[in-house]
Amino acid sequence: MMTGTIETTGNISAKKGGSVILQCHLSSTMAQVTQVNWEQHDHSLLAIRNAELGWHIYPAFKDRVAPGPGLGLTLQSLTMNDTGEYFCTYHTYPDGTYRGRIFLEVLESSGGGGAGGGGHHHHHHHHHH
């Protein structure tokens, strides 16, 4: 039975040109995390963090995605096109797959909102394949 829950940074906002940290945390389970996949709204994989093999940042994002902190991901040099949903997919054993969702809104530099700032409401979601 899957008992775990994913906590995420929920709905966040950051300024154009700035950076933001995408963070998920799996709790309430003893399952072993074997891999975390970071995905974008359009089916693009941003990065994979394999528990043993380390990070693989996808070629299209290498110049502006940094691994970490922890199992999280840092997006840099934000553009308006980065606005949208991001997903962390936790592959675990023996539970299976958990998935969390983050919504990022990129704001014009002149507007309000701080990098990695706005609206840290935690979002809980678990999903199994």
Partner: antibody, heavy 121, light 107 residues
Framework: QVQLQESGPGLVKPSETLSLTCAVY?????????WHWIRQPPGKGLEWIGY???????NYNPSLKSRVTISVDTSKNQFSLKLSSVTAADTAVYYC??????????????WGQGTLVTVSS | EIVMTQSPATLSVSPGERATLSCKAS??????VAWYQQKPGQAPRLLIY???YRYTGIPARFSGSGSGTEFTLTISSLQSEDFAVYYC?????????FGGGTKVEIK
């Protein structure tokens, strides 16, 4: 230039243990990457068996996990595969390969030439 | 386990023509797919990683596309050395799996 070369007996009896070695030239296996075994039954597709990471940790295909051991001999710069309790279904060409996970994800960029192992009495 | 299904099993193409090979995943693998070429008696050779990126030294006539569950390897103008078996592989999950292969033969 990185090169990998498999070696070991070409014939193994049923119920015995298959043992293969992969010698790595041009790179120290303790310096990085993960080192894999893949097999290919005659006329069929490829099946990933497992790997040993340069740190020494291992990971195996769940379908073979109970029979597989992959280990490293750092003094000889080689890694080995042991597959126990073999049957005719284990007859295959066995390949060793390197995975540069940071650059290419789960794709394997260097392969040995392969060695055919036949399980027969 | 994620199952990768390749089609067709055999593709007959004339030299100079275009070849289009298909690979379907049993579940969404985003863009975590690689393609390999294998000639008789040889080891597989990495062509494409991350669904669409050519590996070092691979000619531009090889291109990969797709995301989610459907992927394509295209060889724009087949050369004599391209007749071989091609395999796709997924690495979205922690258990890597390969397709059954497509044999590209001379028509």
């Amino acid at each position: 230039q990185v090169q990998l070369q498999e070696s070991g007996p070409g014939l193994v009896k049923p119920s015995e243990t298959l043992s293969l070695t992969c010698a790595v030239y041009g790179y120290s296996i303790t310096s990085g990457y993960s080192w894999h075994w893949i097999r290919q039954p005659p006329g069929k597709g490829l099946e990933w068996i497992g790997y040993v990471h340069y740190s020494g940790s291992t990971n195996y295909n769940p379908s073979l996990k109970s029979r597989v051991t992959i280990s490293v001999d750092t003094s000889k710069n080689q890694f080995s595969l042991k597959l126990s309790s073999v049957t005719a279904a284990d007859t295959a060409v066995y390949y060793c390969a390197r995975m540069d996970y940071g650059n290419y994800g789960g794709a394997m960029d260097y392969w040995g030439q392969g060695t055919l192992v036949t399980v027969s009495s | 386990e994620i199952v990768m299904t390749q089609s067709p099993a055999t593709l007959s193409v004339s030299p100079g023509e275009r070849a289009t090979l298909s690979c379907k995943a049993s579940q969404d693998v985003r863009t975590a797919v690689a393609w390999y070429q294998q000639k008789p008696g040889q080891a597989p050779r990495l062509l494409i990683y991350s669904a669409s990126y050519r590996y070092t030294g691979i000619p531009a006539r090889f291109s990969g596309s797709g995301s989610g569950t459907e992927f394509t390897l295209t060889i724009s103008s087949l050369q004599s050395e391209d007749f071989a078996v091609y395999y796709c592989q997924q690495y979205y999950s922690t258990q890597w799996t390969f397709g059954g292969g497509t044999k590209v033969e001379i028509k």
